[in-house]
Amino acid sequence: ELQMIQPEKLLLVTVGKTATLHCTVTSLLPVGPVLWFRGVGPGRELIYNQKEGHFPRVTTVSDLTKRNNMDFSIRISSITPADVGTYYCVKFRKGSPENVEFKSGPGTEMALGAKPSAP
């Protein structure tokens, strides 16, 4: 029913710049939050959770022009080599006592592109 769309398989980024990771969701159902992670499995790193936590380098991006989906994209500022990896937007279904992972996007691999040229 719900689709998680991450259109870019690969995103080349530059150290010091801002990276935009796109994710659109076709339905709010099942009810529950969308979180961003880097990597998969139990060792994955939480990148953004709007409801709780402090993520000073992350801001949300909202494209309101699309009638048929919702935008859950994020921007990560001040990129460093430590930020490379594959990023996933993940839909959770509200549950008790804990939310349950429902569906993940296919992932976007963030890799370093060419270094900025000297002025």
Partner: antibody
Framework: EVQLVESGGGLVKPGGSLRLSCAAS????????MSWVRQTPGKGLEWVAT????????YYPDSVKGRFTLSRDNAKNSLYLQMNSLRAEDTAVYYC???????????WGQGTTVTVSS | DIVLTQSPASLAVSLGERATISCRAS??????????MHWYQQKPGQPPKLLIY???NLESGVPDRFSGSGSRTDFTLTINPLQAEDVATYYC??????????FGGGTKVEIK
């Protein structure tokens, strides 16, 4: 042209049951989240139930949970609301409404009136 | 539950003037920068009709004299200029990921 046509309303005694139906046409019913919203003069608009496009997930407010059951038949482009243990406070106009994204209510039917009274 | 408080409850505005309706939510209805607040128009004997979705987006076919603004907890519906056919009751509605979804109490707009 999008059409949502409700039926099944009527007069019922407290504790009784009713089954509301909503026939949909003019859009891809199986792609839409569907809901019922009711309206009373005293309480205004109140969300009553929602079902996901494939019918897997249903949601209800506490006021009807355990008494109302929402289902759908995508092959028949139809939505159903089974209402049991009806109370006087369930008296309202019941609207069937579509939600492409499970967010805003895009289209509404004309409504069917449910009266619960002894 | 997220409570939506609309004000005023009723509003009388001269034809051609601006009508402004406020909707305040008891907590934020924003998700990832999108405000899940919507506005509907209801005329007597008719079902509600979607005017504005996600705070500021004009639904297809709705005249551009209707506009919406706001974020987080404070939202506004503006009709400018008001036309005779705009006499109706207007409702705000939030559909954040916190159930239950709720509606405001409505604002009745009349001609002065």
């Amino acid at each position: 042209e999008v059409q949502l046509v409700e039926s099944g309303g009527g007069l019922v005694k407290p504790g009784g049951s009713l089954r509301l139906s909503c026939a949909a046409s003019g859009f891809t019913f199986s792609s839409y989240v569907m809901s019922w919203v009711r309206q009373t003069p005293g309480k205004g608009l109140e969300w009553v139930a929602t079902i996901s496009s494939g019918g897997t997930y249903t949601y209800y407010p506490d006021s009807v949970k355990g008494r109302f059951t929402l289902s759908r038949d995508n092959a028949k482009n139809s939505l159903y609301l089974q209402m049991n243990s009806l109370r006087a406070e369930d008296t309202a106009v019941y609207y069937c409404a579509s939600q492409l994204t499970g967010s805003e209510f895009d289209y509404w039917g004309q409504g069917t009136t449910v009266t619960v009274s002894s | 539950d997220i409570v939506l408080t609309q004000s005023p409850a009723s509003l009388a505005v001269s034809l051609g003037e601006r009508a402004t309706i406020s909707c305040r939510a008891s907590e934020s209805v924003d998700l990832y920068g999108t405000s899940f607040m919507h506005w509907y128009q209801q005329k007597p004997g008719q079902p509600p009709k979607l005017l504005i979705y996600r705070a500021s987006n004009l639904e297809s076919g709705v005249p551009d004299r209707f506009s919406g603004s706001g974020s987080r907890t404070d939202f506004t519906l503006t009709i400018n200029p008001l036309q005779a056919e705009d006499v109706a009751t207007y409702y705000c509605h939030q559909s954040s990921d916190e159930l239950p979804w709720t509606f405001g109490g409505g604002t009745k707009v009349e001609i002065k």
